[in-house]
């Protein structure tokens, strides 16, 4: 009876379990009753990082110097190239597809530490009593306005993104 499921590192084709190709190799032809799966190593600038049945290897990532990228780790037949940014610049994402001078802290966050050549901007959430309503790479969280010192009262509470709104005190007649 033909199998309905195969072991690990195998795949089901034509009612038969064939071996997957190992990382660094691509599939040339499926196995048959009489032959093993045929695999071929990936080319010079290609890779496959899993046991697979792919007929084409993936191209290594290109670290484009025009985007400020350089090679951090050269790719192999089993791993992709890892890019990083030129000194003083920082990756825009985990995948490091482009570089920025430094990242900003979003509204609700303030700058804890300004970026340097080696470390990007460090942000911190604005605690109660403080706010930031801008995206910035240098501005800290600002304290809420003190209505009391202006002889006013709080008309609208502040948040981590907005200042309090002060208004006149209700005069008792």
């Amino acid at each position: 009876e033909p199998p309905t499921a195969c072991r690990e590192k195998q795949y089901l084709i034509n009612s038969q379990c064939c071996s997957l190709c190992q990382p660094g190799q691509k599939l040339v032809s499926d196995c048959t009753e009489f032959t093993e799966t045929e695999c071929l190593p990936c080319g010079e600038s290609e890779f496959l990082d899993t046991w697979n049945r792919e007929t084409h290897c993936h191209q290594h990532k290109y670290c484009d110097p025009n985007l400020g990228l350089r090679v951090q780790q050269k790719g192999t037949s089993e791993t992709d190239t890892i890019c990083t940014c030129e000194e003083g610049w920082h990756c825009t994402s985990e995948a490091c597809e482009s570089c920025v001078l430094h990242r900003s802290c979003s509204p609700g966050f303030g700058v804890k530490q300004i970026a340097t050549g080696v470390s990007d901007t460090i942000c911190e959430p604005c605690p109660v009593g403080f706010f930031s309503n801008v995206s910035s790479a240098f501005e800290k969280c600002h304290p809420w306005t003190s209505c009391e010192t202006k002889d006013l009262v709080v008309q609208q509470a502040g948040t981590n993104k907005t200042d309090v709104v002060c208004g006149p005190q209700d005069r008792l007649r």
């Epitope: 985007l67 001078l101 430094h102």
Partner: nanobody, 116 residues
Framework: EVQLLESGGGLVQPGGSLRLSCAAS????????MWWVRQAPGKGLERVSA????????YYADSVKGRFTISRDNSKNTLYLQMNSLRAEDTAVYYC?????????RGQGTLVTVSS
């Protein structure tokens, strides 16, 4: 296309002054925080000064505090850096930058040389 064109650099004696300008185009200048950064020969990038979009808040690195003044004219789409009491260690290529500043949008910079 974002363009940042720095100018105003040159050779100046220690103690002297220079005013750098950065003409911006290709984006809404008045909406962006702007920075001056510099790179001394053989050194990394140093963040020198920054200014918020309205020009009401500023930042200065400790190395330039009290000597440099950043300003902007949103009607002219121009950023400035007034540099006084210049020292040999201020010698560098100065770049202006917007936030966020992508590598491929950076300007060419202007060279400031402080020497007697």
């Amino acid at each position: 296309e974002v363009q940042l064109l720095e100018s105003g650099g040159g050779l100046v004696q220690p103690g002297g002054s220079l005013r750098l300008s950065c003409a911006a185009s290709g984006f809404t200048f008045r909406d962006y925080e702007m920075w001056w950064v510099r790179q001394a020969p053989g050194k990394g990038l140093e963040r020198v000064s920054a200014i918020n979009p309205q020009g009401t808040r500023t930042y200065y690195a400790d190395s330039v505090k009290g000597r440099f003044t950043i300003s902007r004219d949103n009607s002219k789409n121009t950023l400035y850096l007034q540099m006084n009491s210049l020292r040999a260690e201020d010698t560098a290529v100065y770049y202006c930058a917007k936030l966020p500043q992508l590598f491929h949008d950076r300007g060419q910079g202007t060279l400031v040389t402080v020497s007697s």
